[in-house]
């Protein structure tokens, strides 16, 4: 017998569905209506046929009582080709739910999203995470999606984006957004970061994650943040191949005084980069290629400095390379 596609845990808390059949029995997902965390993976299926079965233009208020009874707070939908009209229909219905965190992974959104009807209610999400989601509408996708959300979004994560730059003139401000994660967009680069950080649209950012985004120098990132008026408290630049030296012709950049935590781990650094903020609470330089202990004048004034996993800490250690095994003194880097 084939395994059931969905599994609900004993506490009715987490429900995971993996639909891999060409014509899945979607009614199997019904058991997930009791769950708080729901994951639905559609095996790369095209959900276009669903449009024939559902009236995407129906008034979602007719489902309001049922949807209000759902316990789901965290929903992940993955691996499907989804017509924009169907996505919108789902967002309209979920607006009556208690859903707080939505994750979309490995999706291809086809067609354009219609504008929000005047009487429609936006979805009150606190967290939206997108990974490898492509949109037929190109750069305007964030503005189109944003109109279906209430303005209280606190966390936005966009990874493996096909178009990480946004159509800034169409995007409205995210007044409550405190965490923006653009990690795992290796083609972004510093110029792309300038295009993605729409000026004055992210006024409340406290945490900015830019892991594996093709950043080149802390100074270049500083310039992009300054241009956008973004003043994070915490900045993660780990897993970028950073240059320690600054282009002499580049103007010096003044970091925001709000920045108190900077992660430069796994950045391939052989020396402490120039142009760091003058004062930090936390600086993480672990798992780099520092061959000697940084001199006090090379470092910012810092309360909490992490240097684990650098060659200078273990006498006789060569530069770490991928796949190398370090002794027990050095963490696996």
């Amino acid at each position: 017998t084939t395994p059931e596609p969905c599994e609900l845990d004993d506490e009715d808390f987490r429900c995971v569905c993996n639909f891999s059949e060409p014509q899945p029995d979607w009614s199997e997902a019904f058991q997930c209506v009791s769950a708080v965390e729901v994951e639905i993976h559609a095996g790369g299926l095209n959900l276009e046929p669903f449009l024939k079965r559902v009236d995407a233009d129906a008034d979602p208020r007719q489902y309001a009582d049922t949807v209000k009874a759902l316990r789901v707070r965290r929903l992940t939908v993955g691996a499907a080709q989804v017509p924009a009209q169907l996505l919108v229909g789902a967002l309209r219905v979920l607006a009556y739910s208690r859903l707080k965190e939505l994750t979309l992974e490995d999706l291809k959104i086809t067609g354009t999203m219609p504008p929000l009807p005047l009487e429609a209610t936006g979805l009150a999400l606190s967290s939206l995470r997108l990974r490898n989601v492509s949109w037929a509408t190109g750069r305007s996708w964030l503005a189109e999606l944003q109109q279906w959300l209430k303005p209280g979004l606190k966390v936005l994560s966009i990874a493996q984006a096909h178009s990480p730059a946004f159509s800034c003139e169409q995007v409205r401000a995210f007044p409550a957004l405190t965490s923006l994660d653009l990690s795992d967009n290796p083609g972004l680069g510093e110029r792309g970061l300038m295009a993605a950080l729409c000026p004055h649209k992210f006024p409340a950012i406290q945490n900015l994650a830019l892991r594996n985004t093709g950043m080149e120098t802390p100074t270049g990132v500083c310039a992009a943040l300054a241009a956008a008026g973004v003043q994070p408290h915490s900045l993660d630049l780990s897993h970028n191949s950073l240059r320690a030296t600054v282009n002499p012709s580049a103007p010096r950049c003044m970091w925001s005084s709000a920045l108190n935590s900077l992660n430069l781990s796994f950045a391939g650094l052989e020396q402490v980069p120039k142009g760091l903020p003058a004062k930090l609470r936390v600086l993480d330089l672990s798992c780099n290629r520092l061959n000697r202990a940084p001199q006090p004048d090379e470092l910012p004034e810092v309360d909490n400095l992490t240097l684990d996993g650098n060659p200078f800490l273990v006498p006789g250690t060569a530069l770490p390379h991928e796949g190398s095994m370090n002794s027990g003194v050095v963490p696996a880097c």
Partner: nanobody, 115 residues
Framework: QVQLQESGGGLVQAGGSLRLSCAAS????????MGWYRQAPGKEREMVAQ???????NYGDSVKGRFTISRGNARNTVYLQMNNLKPEDTAVYYC?????????WGQGTQVTVSS
């Protein structure tokens, strides 16, 4: 191990009604989603009706408006009230308890609708 026992099937005239019952026994520690499914000779098993632990219901397209699923007062008892029965409702009706690891199915009860 969980056992499911269906009852209430039988022979009925078209337009008539039947009420199926399903009782679950064994190691059940929480109220679980349950459902009714049916299989007619030579056809795939199809979902008839489902009910969640919180009482949310879902019906197959062919039975909407005619069949009603409900839960009993006991932890895992489920009923299927079938009205305005049609010959195409003839099938073996199975009860299902959604359960972690491997779902439990009953042995089935025969429903025959004559024209």
């Amino acid at each position: 191990q969980v056992q499911l026992q269906e009852s209430g099937g039988g022979l009925v005239q078209a337009g008539g009604s039947l009420r199926l019952s399903c009782a679950a026994s064994g190691r059940i520690f929480s109220i679980r989603p349950m459902g009714w499914y049916r299989q007619a000779p030579g056809k795939e098993r199809e979902m008839v009706a489902q009910i969640s632990s919180s009482g949310i219901t879902n019906y197959g397209d062919s039975v909407k408006g005619r069949f009603t699923i409900s839960r009993g007062n006991a932890r895992n008892t489920v009923y299927l009230q079938m009205n305005n029965l049609k010959p195409e409702d003839t099938a073996v009706y199975y009860c299902r308890l959604f359960k972690t690891g491997a779902d439990s199915w009953g042995q089935g009860t025969q429903v025959t609708v004559s024209s």
